[in-house]
């Protein structure tokens, strides 16, 4: 619900300017740490690193998407997994990883110069088994690339990455989806976590930058799962 | 041009209710998050809660938790505040306001409610 | 809850000054701050979102900076239309919360 979303510090898709669609998980970001979700009358953090059976794209990472673990396997035991690479086979836009989408089913990069103004995707955003919006943008809708001239700057309302300038990723803030900058050597990031029912996240982080990956913080190892910090790190 | 229009001044006497309405036009009603807020006299803007006018899915500030309750009628575009146990300290003027992103871009013009015995 | 302190609490500036309001937050907001200024009797309205960015219609007179903690709202040069009640907010962590005003009177 939109009670478990925004009594929280913590967030995934975001809808774009003006009555856009709300994008899928494509876009490049990760989820605050201390996800909060409303417990009784008070916030209350849940860390959850358990891998997570799902229903839909939505549920997993933005590393992620929802399947079948076997070719051709009851749809009825999807679990999130790891998206497929550039070049890799797809059947969908959520199968490949952030930067790609999935065409004559094939991962491709989303830089290309066509991509933009090829597609028009229809998106949906959901929130655990509700469909709704968050800044309210509408919940299924065609959104046609030609709505985007420039690049957002820091601070613009987004729908995905790719309306970002460069050194910016789209990312959800309470109840829009915003550009913002790309993680540097040494801020903290955040490692993918299974959503349930507990509501999409309402802050997102970026992804790290070229050359940086998210990894556990060396003196943070001995700390308690629900503790651990994570930091852009060289590879 | 977006435009939210509220209900007018109402006068209430404590442990009463008050419901204030949010007429919105100008764009799609059911594609942007209705806050509310308030200001008591010469006090800070206090944010109250914001609703989903798709769902009606709703979040509260927690300290008007249990107290307030947003709806919101698709038919007329409309959504309400309807705040209980009215206490003096409850006088404020209550605004709608409608977000385009994290902030606050469009406003009702306010709803005076004034709690006294 | 994230506690905003603006100041000063008012000012007085005359027609053509340079004005500046800072407003303060108790912890780190990164950039997510915005400014709004209201008229007596009027609903607030957004001059500055995400620090500095300005909405769209507001004057160019209008600016935002800072990070972190500490932020500053400028008026390049003040015109008697700009007489009312700014305001700051932080988005960075629900609930949003605001700081008490900063009303500015002209000489």
């Known amino acids: 619900t939109l009670n478990s979303v925004l009594n929280s510090n913590a967030i995934k898709n975001l809808p774009p300017p003006l009555g856009g669609a709300a994008g899928h998980p494509g876009s490049a970001v990760s989820a605050a740490p201390g996800i909060l979700y409303p417990g009784g009358n008070k916030y209350q953090t849940i860390d959850n690193y358990q891998p997570y059976p799902c229903a839909e794209d939505e549920e997993c990472g933005t590393d992620e998407y929802c399947a079948s673990p076997t070719r051709g396997g009851d749809a009825g035991v999807q679990i999130c997994l790891a998206c497929r690479k550039r070049r890799k086979r797809c059947m969908r836009h959520a199968m490949c990883c952030p930067g790609n989408y999935c065409k004559n089913g094939i991962c491709v990069s989303s830089d290309q110069n066509h991509f933009r103004g090829e597609i028009e995707e229809t998106i949906t955003e959901s929130f655990g088994n509700d469909h709704s919006t968050l800044d309210g943008y509408s919940r299924r809708t065609t959104l046609s690339s030609k709505m985007y001239h420039t690049k957002g700057q820091e601070g613009s309302v987004c729908l995905r990455s790719s309306d970002c300038a460069s050194g910016l990723c789209c990312a959800r803030h309470f109840w829009s989806k915003i550009c913002k900058p790309v993680l540097k050597e040494g801020q903290v990031c955040t490692k993918h976590r299974r959503k349930g029912s507990h509501g999409l996240e309402i802050f997102q982080r970026c992804y790290c930058g070229e050359g940086l990956s998210c990894r556990i913080q060396k003196d943070h190892h001995q700390a308690s799962n629900s503790s651990r910090l994570h930091t852009c790190q060289r590879h | 041009q977006v435009q939210l229009v509220q209900s007018g001044a109402e006068v209430k006497k404590p442990g009463a209710s008050v419901k204030v309405s949010c007429k919105a036009s100008?764009?799609?009603?059911?594609?942007?998050?209705m806050h509310w807020v308030r200001q008591a006299p010469g006090q800070r803007l206090e944010w109250m809660g914001v609703?989903?006018?798709?769902?009606?899915?709703?979040s509260y500030n927690q300290k008007f938790k249990g107290r307030v309750t947003l709806t919101v009628d698709k038919s007329s575009s409309t959504a309400y505040m309807e705040l209980s146990s009215l206490r003096s300290e409850d006088t404020a003027v209550y605004y709608c306001?409608?977000?385009?992103?994290?902030?606050?871009?469009?406003w009702g013009q306010g709803t005076l409610v004034t709690v006294s015995s | 809850d994230i506690q905003m302190t603006q100041s000063p609490s008012s000012l007085s500036a005359s027609v053509g000054d340079r004005v500046t309001i800072t407003c303060r937050a108790s912890?780190?907001?990164?950039?997510?701050l915005n400014w709004y200024q209201q008229k007596p009797g009027k609903a607030p309205k957004l001059l500055i979102y995400?620090?500095?960015r300005l909405h769209s219609g507001v004057p160019s007179r209008f600016s935002g900076s800072g990070s972190g903690t500490d932020f500053t709202f400028t008026i390049s040069s003040l015109q008697p239309e700009d007489i009312a009640t700014y305001y700051c907010?932080?988005?960075?962590?629900?609930?949003?919360?605001f700081g008490q005003g900063t009303k500015l009177e002209i000489k």
């Open positions: 609703i989903d006018p798709s769902n009606g899915d709703t």
């Open positions: 100008g764009y799609t009603f059911t594609e942007y998050t």
């Open positions: 306001a409608r977000t385009t992103g994290p902030w606050f871009a469009s």
């Open positions: 995400y620090k500095s």
């Open positions: 912890q780190d907001i990164s950039n997510y």
């Open positions: 907010q932080q988005v960075h962590t629900l609930p949003p919360t």
